[in-house]
Amino acid sequence: AMDLILINSLPLVSDAETSLTCIASGWRPHEPITIGRDFEALMNQHQDPLEVTQDVTREWAKKVVWKREKASKINGAYFCEGRVRGEAIRIRTMKMRQQASFLPATLTMTVDKGDNVNISFKKVLIKEEDAVIYKNGSFIHSVPRHEVPDILEVHLPHAQPQDAGVYSARYIGGNLFTSAFTRLIVRRCEAQKWGPECNHLCTACMNNGVCHEDTGECICPPGFMGRTCEKACELHTFGRTCKERCSGQEGCKSYVFCLPDPYGCSCATGWKGLQCNEACHPGFYGPDCKLRCSCNNGEMCDRFQGCLCSPGWQGLQCEREGIQRMTPKIVDLPDHIEVNSGKFNPICKASGWPLPTNEEMTLVKPDGTVLHPKDFNHTDHFSVAIFTIHRILPPDSGVWVCSVNTVAGMVEKPFNISVKVLPKPLNAPNVIDTGHNFAVINISSEPYFGDGPIKSKKLLYKPVNHYEAWQHIQVTNEIVTLNYLEPRTEYELCVQLVRRGEGGEGHPGPVRRFTTASIGLPPPRGLNLLPKSQTTLNLTWQPIFPSSEDDFYVEVERRSVQKSDQQNIKVPGNLTSVLLNNLHPREQYVVRARVNTKAQGEWSEDLTAWTLSDILPPQPENIKISNITHSSAVISWTILDGYSISSITIRYKVQGKNEDQHVDVKIKNATITQYQLKGLEPETAYQVDIFAENNIGSSNPAFSHELVTLPESQAPADLGGGKMLL
């Protein structure tokens, strides 16, 4: 994920300004980039520290600029270093005097293990001195003065990794400042091979890309990108994703680009020469103009991009019919993602032609770890790579990069991940109240450890000694009642907080234990409540035979309906009744009872009763005579509650007859509210009276009611309870 590029602007130093710029393109280093002198390559070079400054035009770039007056101190070897995951990536380059006696053919030279190599220096100045060649500052070879050729060569018939290094050439009377340098890079493997044992075949790197012996990946020259370096960048751009731009008037002219080994240094595409200031000749393109265009059908050769194929054709020479390749694009990836710590499955989605494959999509963590997809699928338009991070933690927060590298080009999209700590209450919940089947809990959700905001809260509970799963209820308030608990059972309680987002359930907080009360005995059976007097009620029940040895008693609660007057009475368990006294006459009372041991019992249903009346009852109301026939009639009435009415008397006689000739019908069930008089004479007028009796006496009727029976053949009539004043 590290795209480190060192630009050596004018490696041949004259009296002009010269610089080194190190760019970490598309990458966000934790540790700063460093530029330094490469004493490994040249021990006896200048010791002055370098003035490294931030390149103001780029966020992640450092620069060393030498003014023309410092020219004498510049000769030597340099490096740029970037670190990722503790691993250093170092790029090396050199600067030498333009007035040196010899000049190298190239600044660097990359060969494969076993190659037949000639390292050559061109003689620029003729001197009557022996020529000497050094490797990494140590003498290796000399040529007598009269035999110094125009091209001074070091021949390595079978190059090995140990042959790699900085080779310098000068006359024997010269010094470091008149030396010419070139660096030989020997790939650890033979041509087209890579891997620890060099037994893997390299991808065919096009456009002079170089196969990395450790990864098998192509290191693409400046101006090309993609898995095989086949895709040309837009004009004057470079970098692994072609996002960097040469700002010069003539693009990348006079920029020597140095990339990580085994690439070495080269000009950008379209330029050649030690100073990269010469344009390619017609028919040539690419880095150092080393590539020849052999375009099919006379297609145009562009010195920067090679053959410009007609639509429908592709390949370096436009030799393949096929859909034009489209650089991949990363889509639907937000700039910022908030993630809860725990399992995380980021998704990277990309378009392009050909569609990216599983191997071509990676995710790079802030520490530089490269992740490969755990799952992969594609549609007609997109490839979707799903990555799995089993446990993402807050230190993983930072800039992650989705990277897609296909034959059609490479694209990287950085995005910020903010990993949140799941919330966890610091305190256990508090138990405010308990019964045999409920508990009132303060969940104590604050303070909590971790990140909010809290989306929801769960109260988890389970019996301690049961092998049951935790049950939970969603809670909104701090105070919550747990119902349907088991009596006399120890429970564990804890609170789980949930923050927004997937996997937002925090770890449950501290556990609180509590025990529910024992279940109470059932209420007494056969409860009966009757008035005893004007001030007493009598409550009776069946004898109680408890199942345990525990002492028990009967608790009776009575309260007045009319007044706020309540009393609880404890009755020994061996009794079967209690007299409730000191009551008010003509008042309704509600009574209930329970059997208590150490645990309170279950209340009975409510019973109601009135104390006996202290006044005469009122006259029955709503008296109606209906359904009159020739021999019968129905009388109905209502009575007022609360007067201890024990019976109703209906008194009737034929009108005009003597008082003593009346008939009394006594109805002893006061709940009956109608009665059918039978055995009446047809076509006869009767006088009917009705009155109520209680413990004090009878009510006084104010009216008598008239009832006239029908002739024998007629249908029943309703007189509507007409009244006649006596």
């Epitope: 059908n297 297609e299 410009l308 007609s310 639509p311 429908g312 019919e321 096929g322 859909i323 034009q324």
Partner: antibody, heavy 112, light 112 residues
Framework: SGPELKKPGETVKISCKAS????????IHWVKQAPGKGLKWMGW????????TYAEDFKGRFAFSLETSASTAYLQINNLKNEDTATYFC????????????WGQGTLVTVS | DIVMTQAALSVPVTPGESVSISCRSS???????????LYWFLQRPGQSPQLLIY???NLASGVPDRFSGSGSGTAFTLRISRVEAEDVGVYYC?????????FGGGTKLEIK
């Protein structure tokens, strides 16, 4: 191939047989022309690699295929709809840039 | 997608006269290699289309030199000098710069 009369929901497979040249040297393009309407490019198949490209409107129910030994390209349309009623042409280029130089006589597919 | 527009649905012409048929594209058809990827076809009644002009101005093999093509990046013209009876049919322009290739709606050449 000859005209086809099909019902909605059925599948049709029409053929385009090449002769007089090496079949794998030229890709085959398919073009649709609804009755009384203009031409619409459907896509193409690379006869050498079998790689296919479909225009957006022809992704899903349409499939190009090859029988190289018989120098024949095929267009298959699945789950036919009334709007698939059209003449379907196959075409190839003459050389590097003269595309659509040779055309088949067209196959009328009627969906009714 | 690039949209090709042929404004005239039909063009009446007297035999022996010259006629121009125009076509516009929604974006430039000029490729970075300097070529303009605009093609012209003639479809005679009941026949397959026939390539007339490729890359804006190049005459296809076997096409009489009475036909010529010209234009800029987005505006194109097919010119027929000395129209003959056999020139009747529908003329289509097509762009081959980008996928999907797209045709104009067609312009019918009618003899007065």
């Amino acid at each position: 191939s000859g005209p086809e009369l099909k019902k909605p929901g059925e599948t049709v497979k029409i053929s385009c047989k090449a002769s007089g040249y090496t079949f794998t040297d030229f890709s085959i393009h398919w073009v649709k022309q609804a009755p009384g309407k203009g031409l619409k490019w459907m896509g193409w198949i690379n006869t050498e690699t079998g790689e296919t490209t479909y225009a957006e409107d022809f992704k899903g129910r349409f499939a190009f295929s090859l029988e190289t030994s018989a120098s024949t390209a095929y267009l298959q349309i699945n789950n036919l709809k009334n709007e698939d009623t059209a003449t379907y042409f196959c075409s190839r280029r003459y050389d590097y840039d003269t595309w659509f130089a040779y055309w088949g006589q067209g196959t009328l597919v009627t969906v009714s | 997608d690039i949209v090709m527009t042929q404004a005239a649905l039909s063009v009446p012409v007297t035999p022996g006269e010259s006629v121009s048929i125009s076509c516009r594209s929604s974006s430039s058809l000029l490729h970075r290699n300097g070529n303009t990827y605009l093609y012209w076809f003639l479809q005679r009644p009941g026949q397959s289309p026939q390539l007339l002009i490729y890359r804006m101005s190049n005459l296809a093999s076997g096409v009489p030199d009475r036909f010529s093509g010209s234009g800029s990046g987005t505006a194109f013209t097919l010119r027929i000098s000395r129209v003959e009876a056999e020139d009747v049919g529908v003329y289509y322009c097509m762009q081959r710069l980008e996928y999907p290739f797209t045709f104009g709606g067609g312009t019918k050449l009618e003899i007065k």
